[in-house]
């Protein structure tokens, strides 16, 4: 009996342990290659996928080209944004470019916006080569509230890489704020 | 398909102002630089200079540079330019013209004669 | 400006033979390798047309009897063999570097 109720308990905390781990957020979101805007100035990246190819979410929310927070806790953020430019696609208006995404953080009780991660670098992409490419990676630990939303933006949104494996952004919870 | 259609022939006295338009169809008229290149009578090919339209970024040739302007309306997919203080040596056909999807100007307007004289 | 050289100005060649127009640029118009020298034909009255782009690429629906080659500062545009319907004049033209410029010209006489 006691074998059994150990047994029963120790299955018992193994469902628990999973239900939590199903049940910690996170979202994997691909950028959606159909609504790029264009231009070189600064812009918000609005409209990504959640819920094709590689993107996925769970207990966090998408909406308004924002991913929401819905649980508090200790979030590990991450971003991969890809620039590209294949001469067969016209021409570069300036072959000076800056080419940045920034992680922005925006909080709805105390209306707010703050740059998490940033990250980039300037370019020299001559108008004499045939390819360009450029891919910037920023990743960081950061306390989330509940409510609190996260959105990408990006310079010249014209020369982004519009395939779900080099434009993307996501969220996991790692731990409770204690 | 690329078509670029220029305006008809001007007639002008020297020291006066021409603009001649060119007007753009078959692509997105914003990512390519537009170029401009003219041919005087029984003479070779002059490049002048050229337009980006998207944000309007300009490049010209130095002999150029101070009495002549392109613009673009992107609303209209149309080009401009215009050359002032004209003598009788600009007295030309004028080309607008188009780099193809590699290298190379693969696309070319009708042309527009420009013709100065007193 | 980098100027380009052309010759001869003017050649005439029997139907059937060869034609080869030289072009020498001031300096190299090469860079990221490639040539950034292209060949165009003019006929009277019409604007020209692109035979040939960075240096050796035909052009779609250009016939095989024109070829380019060259690199750096000597190209040169061949027409094997000429047919009545080539006498036109010829331009080379380099976009390496601002501003672009074009070659004099080569006037071909069909004889």
């Known amino acids: 009996i006691r074998a059994e109720k150990a047994m029963v308990d120790g299955s018992w905390l193994d469902l628990a342990k999973r239900s939590k781990l199903e049940a910690q957020p996170f979202a994997h979101l691909t950028i959606n290659a159909t609504d790029i805007p264009s231009g070189s100035h600064k812009v918000s990246l609005s409209s990504w996928y959640h819920d094709r190819g590689w993107a996925k979410i769970s207990n966090m929310t998408f909406s308004n080209g924002k991913l929401i927070v819905n649980q508090d806790g200790f979030y590990y953020l991450y971003a991969n944004i890809c620039f590209r430019h294949h001469e067969t696609s016209g021409d570069l208006a300036t072959e000076y470019l800056q080419l940045m995404v920034y992680v922005t953080k925006t909080s709805i009780k105390i209306p707010s916006s703050h740059t998490l991660m940033k990250g980039g670098s300037t370019k020299y992409w001559s108008g004499n080569s045939e390819f360009h490419f450029y891919s910037i990676n920023v990743g960081g630990f950061f306390k989330l509230r509940s409510g609190e939303e996260i959105s990408i933006e990006v310079s010249n949104p014209s020369l982004l890489d519009p395939d779900q494996d080099a434009t993307y952004f996501g969220a996991f919870k790692v731990r409770d704020i204690d | 398909q690329v078509q670029l259609v220029q305006s008809g022939a001007e007639l002008k006295k020297p020291g006066a102002s021409v603009k001649l338009s060119c007007k753009a169809s078959?692509?997105?008229?914003?990512?390519?630089?537009l170029q401009w290149v003219r041919q005087a009578p029984g003479q070779g090919l002059e490049w002048m200079g050229a337009i980006y339209p998207g944000p309007g970024n300009t490049k010209y040739t130095q002999k150029f540079k101070d009495r002549f302007t392109i613009t673009a309306d992107k609303s209209k997919s149309t080009a401009y330019m215009q050359l002032n203080s004209l003598k009788s040596e600009d007295s030309a056909v004028y080309y607008c013209a188009r780099r193809g999807s590699r290298r190379g100007i693969a696309y070319w307007g009708q042309g527009t004669l420009v013709t100065v004289s007193a | 400006n980098i100027v380009l050289t052309q010759s001869p100005a003017s050649l005439a060649v029997s139907l059937g033979q060869r034609a080869t127009i030289s072009c020498r640029a001031s300096?190299?118009?090469?860079?990221?390798?490639?040539?950034?020298m292209h060949w165009y034909q003019q006929r009277p009255g019409q604007p020209p047309t692109l035979l040939i782009y960075l240096a050796s690429n035909l052009e779609s629906g250009v016939p095989v009897r024109f070829s380019g080659s060259g690199s750096r500062t000597d190209f040169t545009l061949t027409i094997d063999p000429v047919e009545a319907d080539d006498a036109a004049t010829y331009y080379c033209q380099q976009d390496n570097e601002d501003p672009y410029t074009f070659g004099g010209g080569t006037k071909l006489e069909i004889k």
């Open positions: 300096e190299s118009v090469d860079s990221y390798g490639r040539s950034f």
């Open positions: 078959g692509y997105t008229f914003t990512t390519y630089w």
